[in-house]
Interface confidence: low
Amino acid sequence: MAVTACQGLGFVVSLIGIAGIIAATCMDQWSTQDLYNNPVTAVFNYQGLWRSCVRESSGFTECRGYFTLLGLPAMLQAVRALMIVGIVLGAIGLLVSIFALKCIRIGSMEDSAKANMTLTSGIMFIVSGLCAIAGVSVFANMLVTNFWMSTANMYTGMGGMVQTVQTRYTFGAALFVGWVAGGLTLIGGVMMCIACRGLAPEETNYKAVSYHASGHSVAYKPGGFKASTGFGSNTKNKKIYDGGARTEDEVQSYPSKHDYV
C-alpha cells in the first residue's frame, strides 16, 4: 500500500512539475525591466526565451518574436536547449510511469518489469528536473551579471559621455515557476525511485517453503517468521513473504524442492 501511494504521489508531483516546466518555458516573463530609478514610466519591457514584449501604461501589450537564430546569445540558446530536453525527458518519463503504476494492470506484466519502468521514469524525472533547474539558474546568472554591468554603465552613461547604456533587467516570474517546477519534478523522480525498491520482488538465496494445513496456511521465510490463519482477511492464502503480491495459485511458477500438502 505504501509503495503504491509513494509511486502514485511521485507520479502526480512529477506531472505537476513537468506542467510547470512547460509553462515556464512558454512564459514571456523570464526577465523584467528593473523599474528602480527608471525614468521611462510609460512602458515596461519584459522578455522570454522566444520573444520580447512591451506593455504600455494603458495596458496594451505588444510582443515580437526573436526571428533570428544565429544572432541570439549562446547562453540563451543553451537555456532553450536545457528546457526543451527537460520537457522531452519529462514527457517520456510520464509515459513510462503511467504503464509502471501499480494500480494499472496491463496484461500479465511482472512486478519486476513495473519496478524497472518505475526506476527508469524516476531517473528521467530527476534528469528532467535538473535540466530545468540548470536552465533557469544559467539564465538567472546571466541576468545578475548583466544587471550589475548595466548598473555600472547606467551611472557612467548619464553624464552624456557614454551614449549607450543597457537597460537593467531583473528576475521574472518564469524563473521562480521554473525553479519550483524543476524541484517538484526532481522530488517526484526521487519518490519514483524509492517506490521502485518496494516494487521489486525480494530475491533470496533460498526458495521459501510453504506449509499447508487444513484450514490454516503458514508461510516460512528464511530470516524471519510470519504466520497467518486461513480465516479472516487472508482467505486466498496469500504468501506473506513476498508482500502478498501473488496468490497461492501462482506457486506453480516457482517450483520448490519441497512441496508439502
Epitope: 521611462v40 515580437r64 548583466n146
Partner: nanobody, 121 residues
Framework: QVQLVESGGGLVQPGGSLRLSCAAS????????MGWYRQAPGKQRELVAT???????NYADSVKGRFTISGDNAKNTVYLQMNNLKPEDTAVYYC???????????????WGQGTLVTVSS
C-alpha cells in the same frame, strides 16, 4: 551599431517654436520606445516625452500642452514639436531609444549626443 542623430536645436526667443528630430540607424528594431530627455546646466536629466512603436505618448507635466511628440516608424525617426517655449526650457535635449534588435537579447537604451536649445530674448 545603433546611432541616434539629433537635429533642429538652436537659439529661439520666448514664445517661439522649434522642431527637433532624431533618426535612428544601424539596426533592425523589433520593439522600440523613443523619446526626448533634457538636461539643464547643473540639473539632472529629466523626461520630456516618449512615444512607443504603437504611437502611445507620455509627457512631463511641465511640457504638456506645449510640446508634441510624433514618430515615423518607417524612417525610425522621432520628432518633438516645441511651441510657446519658455526660458526654463533651455537645456541640452537628448534623443532616447529603448530598442530591442534580434541580436540583442537584452533591450538597449541608446542616447544621442544631444542638441542644445536656448530660449532667450
Amino acid at each position: 551599431q545603433v546611432q541616434l542623430v539629433e537635429s533642429g536645436g538652436g537659439l529661439v526667443q520666448p514664445g517661439g517654436s522649434l522642431r527637433l528630430s532624431c533618426a535612428a540607424s544601424g539596426g533592425i528594431f523589433s520593439i522600440g520606445v523613443m523619446g526626448w530627455y533634457r538636461q539643464a546646466p547643473g540639473k539632472q536629466r529629466e523626461l520630456v516625452a516618449t512615444i512607443t512603436s504603437r504611437g502611445s505618448t507620455n509627457y512631463a507635466d511641465s511640457v504638456k500642452g506645449r510640446f508634441t511628440i510624433s514618430g515615423d516608424n518607417a524612417k525610425n525617426t522621432v520628432y518633438l514639436q516645441m511651441n510657446n517655449l519658455k526660458p526654463e526650457d533651455t537645456a541640452v535635449y537628448y534623443c532616447y531609444a529603448d530598442l530591442i534588435r534580434p541580436g540583442d537579447f537584452y533591450g538597449m537604451d541608446y542616447w544621442g549626443q544631444g542638441t542644445l536649445v536656448t530660449v532667450s530674448s
